[in-house]
């Protein structure tokens, strides 16, 4: 069971300092941006991180949404990352959900975060280069200290 608590506005960056944004095709991508670029590209660079109470002791449960024309929420259904047109629900009556991730602070690195899928244990949001694009994907942690699954989250409110 997950019960919604509060939400905050955040900018999410990978460890190469690239900013996560949602492009015109609704794809989550990372790109080099100055602070003014980041502001100019809002609301596509501003993510709504909604926190949820979890009935099990597993960590800070969150959804990640973005509001352009409508609100879309990040999903990892079938281990494929996409934004679905939906509001983060007030309650989820299940112990797993494709839209719930556990936001974890990496021990020894308080400012570095990981997002583990509640549906697929051991799978994390990651940044992966594909041709010229840096894409947000879901990835099984396959090596210790994998930097691609670490992010910084900067609160904007």
């Amino acid at each position: 069971y997950f019960g919604k608590l509060e939400s905050k506005l955040s900018v999410i960056r990978n460890l190469n300092d690239q900013v996560l944004f949602i492009d015109q095709g609704n794809r989550p991508l990372f790109e080099d941006m100055t602070d003014s670029d980041c502001r100019d590209n809002a609301p596509r660079t501003i993510f709504i991180i909604s926190m949820y109470k979890d009935s099990q002791p597993r960590g800070m449960a969150v959804t990640i949404s973005v509001k352009c024309e409508k609100i879309s929420t990040l999903s990892c259904e079938n281990k494929i990352i996409s934004f679905k047109e939906m509001n983060p629900p007030d309650n989820i009556k299940d112990t797993k959900s494709d839209i719930i991730f556990f936001q974890r602070s990496v021990p020894g690195h308080d400012n570095k975060m990981q997002f583990e899928s509640s549906s697929y244990e051991g799978y994390f949001l990651a940044c992966e280069k594909e041709r010229d694009l840096f894409k947000l994907i879901l990835k099984k942690e396959d090596e210790l200290g994998d930097r691609s699954i670490m992010f910084t989250v900067q609160n904007e409110d």
Epitope: L5, P57, F102, R104, S105, D110
Partner: antibody, heavy 120, light 110 residues
Framework: EVQLVQSGAEVKKPGSSVKVSCKAS????????ISWVRQAPGQGLEWMGW?????????FYAQKFQGRVTITADESTSTAYMELSSLRSEDTAVYYC????????????WGQGTLVTVSS | QSVLTQPPSASGTPGQRVTISCSGS????????VNWYQQLPGTAPKLLIY???HRPSGVPDRFSGSKSGTSASLAISGLQSEDEADYYC???????????FGGGTKLTVL
Amino acid sequence: EVQLVQSGAEVKKPGSSVKVSCKASGGTFNSYAISWVRQAPGQGLEWMGWINPFYIGETFYAQKFQGRVTITADESTSTAYMELSSLRSEDTAVYYCARAAYHPLVFDNWGQGTLVTVSS
Amino acid sequence: QSVLTQPPSASGTPGQRVTISCSGSSSNIGNHYVNWYQQLPGTAPKLLIYRNNHRPSGVPDRFSGSKSGTSASLAISGLQSEDEADYYCQSWDYSGFSTVFGGGTKLTVL
């Protein structure tokens, strides 16, 4: 770097209560669970319970301590408290607070410990 | 009596590799991650290994963790005198709905 600083040693009479504090500095206090773990002289570690200030002060206690322990937090001062009542000699121990930032059960930061001695 | 079972003591000479075991059941280690803590004499415990085999930054790679079935182990290679400490394993126990520690293993560097 987060630091947890605990209150000083206490000597208490059997039947009384003790309240130990744990002040956090250098991090986001209300995002993480704070657990309390005790260690009797020459013995191992024993988990007592946690508070998750982020979850509006949600607490969870180990069965053994239920009814006797109360864990609270004051967000304004980034301080967690553990109160243990009906003290007996077996409660003589070092009491540690521990922060869990990665997972509620991964104690990645510990206070220095507070020795509580229960003696008549 | 601890829910997780560790040998009370272990020893080795400098440079050696030592392993400390932690045995549990399906209600704890069998279905949950294992963490390891090091407690140097007179100090608070310190997180050494989390999530079976992950090291926090600052922990030397001489320390490694593994898990198989309902048991876990901590390996220390290239043993050094400063490794002399108590080591505790920890897991979640569904039957008691609480986190549990092993009884601790006192490591002596001869």
